[in-house]
C-alpha cells in the first residue's frame, strides 16, 4: 500500500469501536500467520486515502477460499457504503503493484493503527 | 530494547513551573502514544493524559487540565510535561509510559520515573 | 468517567499461595484492561494487557481473565518475588483510569 502518509478522511470514518474491532481482527491474522496468508495470493496495491475503505475491500474481495480473512472482508464491507463485488476497481487502486495478501494486511494495519490514534488525541 | 529515560529529581518552590522530558529509544518513536502518570507519596497511580507524537493532538484528565501541558518533540524522540502553579499537593513520582495500544497496551514500556518536590 | 474498583486493598499470602485479585468497572471496558506490579522505589510493570493476554517475559504463574465489568488477576503459586502491589488499568475510553492498588504482602 502506499501514501502512507497525510492524513485525508479515509470516508466514511467508522465509529473509534468498530475501527478498533478491525484493527483487532487485522492483528490476530498477522500474528496467527503460520503458512503464508492466502497461500500467497496476491492483490492491488491500494493509495491509503479518501475511500481506502472500498479499495482495500475491492482488492481483497478478489481473494476467495481464504477464510483467514473473511472475517475482515465482512468488517471492510461495513465501512464501505456502496455494493463492492469482484473484478470491480476504483482509481484508489495502484494498477502497476501487486503486493502478498500478508503484506497488503500488515501495510493496511499499520495505516489503521495510525488513524486510531488519531481520532483518539484530536 | 524499548528504554524511556526521564530526566533527573527537582525541587521546586510553590508558583514555580517544572519541565519534565522523557527520552525514547529502540522503537519509532510516532508509533505509539505517550502517557503520563502521577504517583503521590504512598498513594496509587493517577493517568494524566497523553499525546499522539506523529500529530501532537492530546488527550486528558480533566483533573489535571491547566496543570499539565504535554508536548513532543520527533526530531529527538522526547516527549516533555511542563507542570505550571506548582503547589506542595504536585510533590509526587511522576512517569511516562508508552505502548502499542493493541500489542502490550497503551503503557507496556515506562521510564524510571521523575520525583517533584514542591517546598517553600 | 469509569470508576475502576480494585479489591481487596491489601492480603498477606504465603510462598505457594493461590492469589486472586479483582477488578470492577463502573461499566462495560470492553476487556481493554492491563494489570500492572509495582515494587517500592520503582515504576510499574505491564504483566497482562487485553484482560488476558500476558507480556513477552512474564512468568506464566500470572493469568487475567473477565470480560464487561469484572476482571481478574490471578498468581497461580505465589513466588518469593511477586510480594509487591498491584494495579489495574481500563484503556477502554478517556480518561484512563486505575484500580486504587492490592498490596500483597508476605503472611
Known amino acids: 500500500l502506499t501514501c502512507l502518509g497525510g492524513f485525508a478522511s479515509p470516508g466514511p470514518v467508522p465509529p473509534s469501536t468498530a475501527l478498533r474491532e478491525l484493527i483487532e481482527e487485522l492483528v490476530n491474522i498477522t500474528q496467527n500467520q503460520k503458512a503464508p496468508l492466502c497461500n500467497g495470493s496476491m492483490v492491488w496495491s491500494i493509495n491509503l486515502t479518501a475511500g481506502m475503505y472500498c479499495a482495500a475491500l475491492e482488492s481483497l474481495i478478489n481473494v476467495s477460499g481464504c477464510s483467514a480473512i473473511e472475517k475482515t472482508q465482512r468488517m471492510l464491507s461495513g465501512f464501505c457504503p456502496h455494493k463492492v463485488s469482484a473484478g470491480q476497481f476504483s482509481s484508489l487502486h495502484v494498477r502497476d503493484t501487486k503486493i502478498e495478501v500478508a503484506q497488503f494486511v500488515k501495510d493496511l494495519l499499520l495505516h489503521l493503527k495510525k488513524l486510531f490514534r488519531e481520532g483518539q488525541f484530536n | 530494547e524499548v528504554q524511556l529515560v526521564q530526566s533527573g529529581a527537582e525541587v521546586k518552590k510553590p508558583g514555580a513551573t517544572v519541565k519534565i522530558s522523557c527520552k525514547v529509544s529502540?522503537?519509532?518513536?510516532?508509533?505509539?502514544?505517550m502517557h503520563w502518570v502521577q504517583q503521590a507519596p504512598g498513594k496509587g497511580l493517577e493517568w494524566i493524559g497523553g499525546i499522539d507524537p506523529e500529530t501532537g493532538g492530546t488527550a486528558s484528565n480533566q483533573k489535571f487540565k491547566g496543570k499539565a501541558t504535554l508536548t513532543a518533540d520527533k526530531s529527538t524522540d522526547t516527549a516533555y510535561m511542563e507542570l505550571s502553579s506548582l503547589r506542595s499537593e504536585d510533590t509526587a513520582v511522576y512517569y511516562c509510559?508508552?505502548?502499542?495500544?493493541f500489542g502490550g497496551g497503551p503503557f507496556a514500556y515506562w521510564g524510571q520515573g521523575t520525583l517533584v518536590t514542591v517546598s517553600s | 468517567d469509569i470508576k475502576m474498583t480494585q479489591s481487596p486493598s491489601s492480603l498477606s499470602a504465603s510462598v505457594g499461595d493461590r492469589v486472586t485479585i479483582t477488578c470492577k468497572a463502573s461499566?462495560?471496558?470492553?476487556?481493554?484492561l492491563s494489570w500492572f506490579q509495582q515494587k517500592p522505589g520503582k515504576a510499574p510493570k505491564t504483566l497482562i494487557y487485553?484482560?488476558?493476554r500476558l507480556v513477552d517475559g512474564v512468568p506464566s504463574r500470572f493469568s487475567g481473565s473477565g470480560s464487561g465489568q469484572d476482571y481478574t488477576l490471578t498468581i497461580s503459586s505465589l513466588d518469593p518475588e511477586d510480594f509487591a502491589t498491584y494495579y489495574c488499568l481500563q484503556y477502554d475510553e478517556f480518561p484512563y483510569t486505575f484500580g486504587g492498588g492490592t498490596k500483597v504482602e508476605i503472611k
Open positions: 509510559t508508552s505502548g502499542d495500544y
Open positions: 461499566q462495560d471496558i470492553n476487556s481493554y
Open positions: 487485553r484482560a488476558n
Open positions: 529502540g522503537y519509532t518513536f510516532t508509533d505509539y502514544e
